[in-house]
């Protein structure tokens, strides 16, 4: 059953996209560690910065202003129902001017904790996934996605925000991590490397994949992203690794074929609606899950990460298009836009399947050391 949308009162004009651009800023966030093609194994024990206490002092998020009295919601699904507003429902968006959060980049200054103190928190993302250390958790049921099949109209905004390519999703895409753990999708974006250099954010046994997709969701318990930031389970990200395969991926081609139009930083285009679920692996039952953070400033913690065991295949040409088309700040290519893996600091990654026995994207010895924290839920 679809979750009903908020209908009464005035449209909520704020809080927006998520992980790559959670505050709806023109440009969000920088990295304290330069992204590396390959993080050394065991890096999870070596934080990139000193571990400062958590992320309590998050920057305030201001609602976006509305244009011409119209609905200009960034990515929030809780929009006014048709009839009340002065115009039809719409997901045409205007970014507000960048503020303190917007001056960051991958590699070099300023250090991310200076951009947002939460970036020095203890429970950050991404992490290295070691399947044999994951706790098998039978309570983790197959993910449920509803409304991810979109007709061609209305079109969706595809934007080069200088840090990634981001597709803003319309309201109505619902995802459940389990009973009572319901979310609405806000946006998706990608992370990649460069020619011959992989660029996924998460790694498996130290292995970095060519690229990674993130679909960012807001818990239905919150009306706006700024309310959810830093709250446990307030945001959830579905992540999948992209690998090279022999055939062109037709779902991804609908986006990749449009990248030339948004080569310049800050540029955007409109693309026909598509089956968003086709961008993800088909097996929704086998995944890893842990609590982490946004992988870009403000690096807010409490984010539930779900990393699919199954990968998505793109052709070599498609992966090349992804890593070699867009431009970022300062006339530099938009490449290697991934954060170094962060220490687990005692966190246990859960698996919805016996990963240590049967092995994940990268096989390991069949050992299961950790027990499922959610057992009996």
């Amino acid at each position: 059953q679809r979750l009903p949308r908020m209908q009464e009162d005035s449209p909520l004009g704020g809080g927006s996209s998520g992980e790559d651009d959670p505050l709806g800023e023109e440009d969000l966030p920088s990295e304290e560690d330069s992204p590396r093609e390959e993080d050394p194994p065991g890096e999870e024990d070596l934080p990139g910065e000193e571990d400062l206490p958590g992320e309590e002092d998050l920057p305030e998020v201001k609602p976006k202003s509305e244009e011409e009295g119209s609905l200009k919601l960034e990515d929030l699904p809780t929009v006014e129902a048709p009839g009340d507003p002065q115009e039809p429902q719409n997901n045409a968006h205007r970014d507000k001017e960048g503020d303190d959060q917007s001056h960051w980049r991958y590699g070099g200054d300023p250090p991310w904790p200076r951009v947002s103190p939460a970036c020095a928190g203890r429970f950050q993302s991404p992490v290295d996934i070691r399947p044999q250390l994951a706790a098998f958790c039978p309570a983790l049921r197959p993910l449920e996605l509803l409304g991810f099949q979109l007709p061609p109209l209305p079109e969706l905004r595809l934007r080069n925000n200088g840090h990634s390519v981001q597709l803003t999703l319309p309201p109505g895409l619902e995802m459940a991590l389990g009973p009572g753990r319901e979310y609405r999708a806000l946006q998706l974006h990608l992370h990649w490397g460069a020619a011959g250099r992989p660029g996924s954010e998460h790694t498996v046994e130290g292995h970095r994949f060519p690229a990674e997709i993130h679909v960012v969701h807001l818990s239905t318990a919150f009306a706006r992203v700024d309310e959810a930031l830093g709250r446990p389970g307030g945001l959830a990200v579905l992540a999948a690794f992209l690998e090279e395969g022999p055939e062109e991926n037709s779902a991804y081609e609908q986006l990749l074929s449009r990248l030339e139009e948004i080569a310049e930083e800050g540029s955007e285009t409109q693309v026909p609606g598509l089956d968003i679920s086709a961008l993800l692996p088909s097996d929704f039952s086998r995944y890893f899950q842990y609590e982490g953070s946004l992988t870009t400033p403000p690096c807010a913690q409490g984010v539930i990460w779900t990393v699919f065991n199954q990968t998505v295949m793109l052709s070599a040409k498609q992966l090349h298009t992804l890593s070699d088309t867009l431009w970022g700040p300062g006339d530099s290519r938009l490449q290697l836009n991934f954060r170094a893996t962060q220490p687990l600091n005692g966190r246990v990654i859960e698996a919805s399947f016996p990963a240590g026995v049967d092995s994940s994207p990268r096989a390991a010895e069949p050992v299961q050391l950790n027990s499922c924290l959610a057992a009996g839920d």
């Epitope: 719409n90 209305p154 079109e155 319309p170 309201p171 109505g172 409109q270 609606g273 089956d275």
Partner: antibody, heavy 118, light 111 residues
Amino acid sequence: QVQLVQSGGGLVQPGGSLRLSCAASGFTFSSYAMSWVRQAPGKGLEWVSAISGSGGSTYYADSVKGRFTISRDNSKNTLYLQMNSLRAEDTAVYYCATYGDYGSLDYWGQGTLVTVSS
Amino acid sequence: QSVLTQPPSVSGAPGQRVTISCTGSSSNIGAGYDVHWYQQLPGTAPKLLIYANNNRPSGVPDRFSGSKSGTSASLAITGLQAEDEADYYCQSYDSSLRAWVFGGGTKLAVL
């Protein structure tokens, strides 16, 4: 408030042409995809054509493909349907409508009658 | 023949509950596309009644509700009133036809 005011309907002979207009007001026209839907006398609704907000993408029902052309002039806040090679079966009330976020047709024009007859 | 199948007519007495079904296939409703419902009062343009399967635009009474399951959807009207007498249409998108599709319409008579 949102208003869609249609014009251009009338009587035309088979094989003839007609251009329908839909003048929009009360919202940022260029931000919204638009559609044409028709209803033959005593019959149900039939989707005819659709166009994206920028006008860059257009879609047609098989029954009108190659004969009808949807277009828009965002500077004039107006949607058009150019109908060529008209047939008797094109006789209908034509409605313009706006697409909302969910793909529903949220607002409709008042309709304009097109009669194709000799 | 419409891609989405609706009963040609339904009827009910004032205060009663009626449902209107809308049956599609694996390329439209069954593929996961949203279903929307429209009400067309005699001599007027259609009006959006239910969007995205079960959501009511503001101004639409809560007597109207929608649901969707598998390859079909339904519209329920409770506490039937004389002013509900109208034609009702379901609509979705069909990926095989690459077209937006409507049901044939259902005429509701309030007895």
